[in-house]
């Protein structure tokens, strides 16, 4: 596949696919009944538009962009999704007390369009 296309956002700063952090409590996430700690999570997620060839992950994403321009009602634009993840450890409730559990796909590390 060709090299990933550039990181210049034609829509203006902060409008295109990027990593965004949202502070969320266990209650916000609906986790309060099974997670004990941390009580607050800095959730990193991928948000923003995928115009032109912006951060196209692969050739398929480039094709999708081109076809979306031609047939916007039929072919959706590429979506902004995590390219990789940061792991996170939670202290959670168990039948016998508490335990640690590692989740390796919980937090986005970086983003691309696919």
């Amino acid at each position: 596949a060709r090299a990933r296309n550039g990181d210049h956002c034609p829509l203006g700063p902060g409008r295109c696919c990027r990593l965004h952090t949202v502070r969320a409590s266990l209650e916000d996430l609906g986790w309060a009944d099974w997670v004990l700690s941390p009580r607050e999570v800095q959730v990193t997620m991928c948000i923003g538009a995928c115009p032109s060839q912006f951060r196209a992950a692969n050739m398929h994403a480039q094709i999708k962009t081109s076809l979306h321009r031609l047939k916007p009602d039929t072919v959706p634009a590429p979506c902004c999704v995590p390219a990789s993840y940061n792991p996170m450890v939670l202290i959670q409730k168990t039948d016998t007390g508490v335990s640690l559990r590692t989740y390796d796909d919980l937090l986005a590390k970086d983003c691309h369009c696919i």
Epitope: P38, Q42, P87, M88, V89, I91, R101, T102, D104, L107
Partner: antibody
């Protein structure tokens, strides 16, 4: 500046009790977990357990479950490691360490407390 | 016996490149991340690399980490006398216990 300052070296006899401390400063103490790590003389690092100072939830390595107690007093930003009956094999350097934001690594370490147990 | 296997020692001359390996299994390194710590003689460990290949601020870019399959590596380029230390890898096992490698003593020759 983030700092973890541990209590001083201890020399004890087998069967005695001991409580060592780790005081955190330069950050919100209740926002980060604290772990304890043992290093026996000339040996590697062994994870003992973790505490969430906010809710005082503790989890122990199976190797240390029932052998030690980890606690914290958030009002004075201090975590503790204690033994009710020391053995000669408890002779080691003990480190407290702060967990990074995602709980997956130790980003700051105390200077260590050397515990010597000898009759 | 450590869950993660490291060579007991490695050595290199100043300016050289050395690598330290850390071998695990499909229940730890294979599916999770690896962190590396440096322990200079007589001091506490210090975080060197986290999440396979990230350097905390203040760590020189001579230090780099990588992971492939069930193994990880720490590379040190432009070796300096002050790099002489013990190096430990760390990950988790299947029950989310934190596990360390046995440690590798790096000797800078000459």
């Amino acid at each position: 500046e983030v700092q973890l300052v541990q209590s001083g070296a201890e020399v004890k006899k087998p069967g005695e009790s001991l409580k060592i401390s780790c005081k955190g400063s330069g950050y919100s103490f209740t926002s980060y977990w604290i772990g304890w790590v043992r290093q026996m003389p000339g040996k590697g690092l062994e994870w003992m357990g973790v505490i969430d100072p906010d809710g005082s939830y503790t989890i122990y390595s199976p190797s240390f479950q029932g052998q030690v107690t980890i606690s914290a007093d958030k009002s004075i930003s201090t975590a503790y490691l204690q033994w009710s009956s020391l053995k000669a094999s408890d002779t080691a350097m003990y480190y407290c360490a702060r967990y990074g934001r995602y709980g997956t690594y130790f980003d700051y370490w105390g200077q260590g407390t050397l515990v010597t147990v000898s009759s | 016996q450590s869950v993660l296997t490291q060579p007991p020692s490695v050595s290199g001359a100043p300016g050289q490149r050395v690598t330290i390996s850390c071998s695990g299994s499909s229940s730890n390194i294979g599916v999770l991340y690896v962190n590396w710590y440096q322990q200079l003689p007589g001091t506490a460990p210090k975080l060197l690399i986290y999440s396979n290949d990230n350097r905390p601020s203040g760590v020189p870019d001579r230090f780099s980490g990588s992971k492939s399959g069930t193994s990880a590596s720490l590379a040190i380029t432009g070796l300096q006398a002050e790099d002489e230390a013990d190096y430990y890898c760390q990950s988790w096992d299947s029950s989310s216990n934190y596990v360390f490698g046995g440690g590798t003593k790096l000797t800078v020759l000459g």
